[in-house]
């Protein structure tokens, strides 16, 4: 014997209530496949979620996060607060990274220069707080005359962090 | 979607060499911090440490330090966790998860096994 | 490094509150946030940033982090919420996530 509810198409449910019979998903819910006996309830984007796209009697709300944040998570089921290039997000908000870290993204948190003489090369160019030092090419392979700038940036072996 | 999917269970012997991967898709993979978990038969949760995998960044917690190795390939979006020198002691269940503090995405675990 | 201390179990009838404990020196200091996970699976955000709830995860779950304690509460406890809870913490000093050693909640 088939189950009458498998006929119920996707946006209905099957109504127990009323003799198995196929009802719309009331107002803020919805189903997304046949056969479903309850309407899931919509998902909401409150406070720092916004709605990227409206529920359907067949398919969820979809959020993204408003600006000056950022998802994370399936979904976007959560969201972080931004910082600008060369900051890290602690509890008491977006802090300056200290000197000899860097951060390139609107997120994550800052990391030591690389030691370019740990490579045998030397500093071409100078870190910043949102850029990384750029590496040359080694002290021995420059030109007699030259110099190259060598700023006291912290060690970068692997497993070692700022202080 | 993003997806962070490990490699499968391993059967060691003690003094054996081992590496692991969790190769990351759906995202910006060089971008985001890879973290890795240990996971001791019925206990609990242990962070081991995390790369950067834009610049092979790593940092260890103290408890792992000199025991393991945390590397990365972002040309093909996938993270290790590798050992020179197996133990018994090393037998769990090994998570790498996207995340230095909240980690959002979670790979399915690699079970390790060490005993002779 | 901060060492995060939960409970080793805690247990509640259906429909009471749960309340499951995280401490650590000034744990309040900085962000807390709680993982649950069940047998044979891979632990899942319920609550990040002391107080914030991924959408997906019941309004029955909330937290709060303040002085040396951060707290998962869990208001009308459900069968479905038996597992084990882990809190855990980003620390600036040492750039180390650390993990509280677990509790495991009973709905009995």
């Known amino acids: 014997l088939q189950d009458p509810c498998s006929n119920c198409p996707a946006g209905t449910f099957c109504d127990n209530n009323r003799n198995q019979i196929c009802s719309p998903c009331p107002p803020n819910s919805f189903s997304s496949a046949g056969g479903q006996r309850t309407c899931d309830i919509c998902r909401q984007c409150k406070g720092v979620f916004r709605t990227r796209k409206e529920c359907s009697s067949t398919s969820n709300a979809e959020c993204d996060c408003t600006p000056g944040f950022h998802c994370l998570g399936a979904g976007c089921s959560m969201c972080e607060q931004d910082c600008k290039q060369g900051q890290e997000l602690t509890k008491k908000g977006c802090k300056d990274c200290c000197f000899g870290t860097f951060n390139d993204q609107k997120r994550g948190i800052c990391r030591p220069w690389t030691n370019c003489s740990l490579d045998g090369k030397s500093v071409l160019v100078n870190g910043t707080k949102e850029r990384d030092v750029v590496c040359g090419p080694s002290p021995a392979d420059l030109s007699p005359g030259a110099s190259s700038v060598t700023p006291p940036a912290p060690a970068r072996e692997p497993g070692h962090s700022p202080q | 979607q993003v997806q962070l999917v490990q490699s499968g269970a391993e059967v060691k012997k003690p003094g054996e060499s081992l590496k692991i991967s969790c190769k990351g898709s759906?995202?910006?993979?060089?971008?985001?911090?890879i973290s890795w978990v240990r996971q001791m038969p019925g206990k609990g949760l242990e962070w081991m440490g995390k790369?950067?995998?834009?610049?092979?960044?790593?940092n260890y917690s103290p408890s792992f330090q000199g025991q393991v190795t945390i590397s990365a390939d972002k040309s093909i979006s996938t993270a290790y966790l590798q050992w020179s020198s197996l133990k018994a002691s090393d037998t769990a269940m090994y998570y790498c998860?996207?995340?230095?503090?909240?980690?959002?995405?979670w790979g399915q675990g690699t079970l390790v096994t060490v005993s002779s | 490094d901060i060492e995060l201390t939960q409970p080793p179990s805690v247990s509640v009838a259906p429909g009471q509150t749960a309340r499951i404990s995280c401490s650590g020196d000034?744990?309040?200091?900085?962000?807390a946030h709680w993982y649950q996970q069940k047998p044979g699976q891979a632990p899942v955000v319920v609550i990040y940033?002391?107080?914030n709830r991924p959408s997906g995860i019941p309004e029955r779950f909330s937290g709060s982090n303040s002085g040396n304690t951060a707290t998962l509460t869990i208001s009308g406890t459900q069968a479905e919420d038996e597992a084990d809870y882990y809190c855990?913490?980003?620390?600036?000093?040492?750039?180390?996530?650390?993990f509280g050693g677990g509790t495991k909640l009973t709905v009995l």
């Open positions: 998860a996207r995340g230095y503090g909240i980690f959002d995405y």
């Open positions: 759906g995202y910006s993979f060089s971008t985001y911090w």
């Open positions: 790369i950067y995998p834009g610049d092979s960044y790593t």
């Open positions: 000034n744990i309040g200091d900085q962000y």
């Open positions: 940033q002391d107080k």
């Open positions: 855990s913490t980003y620390t600036f000093v040492g750039f180390t996530t650390v």
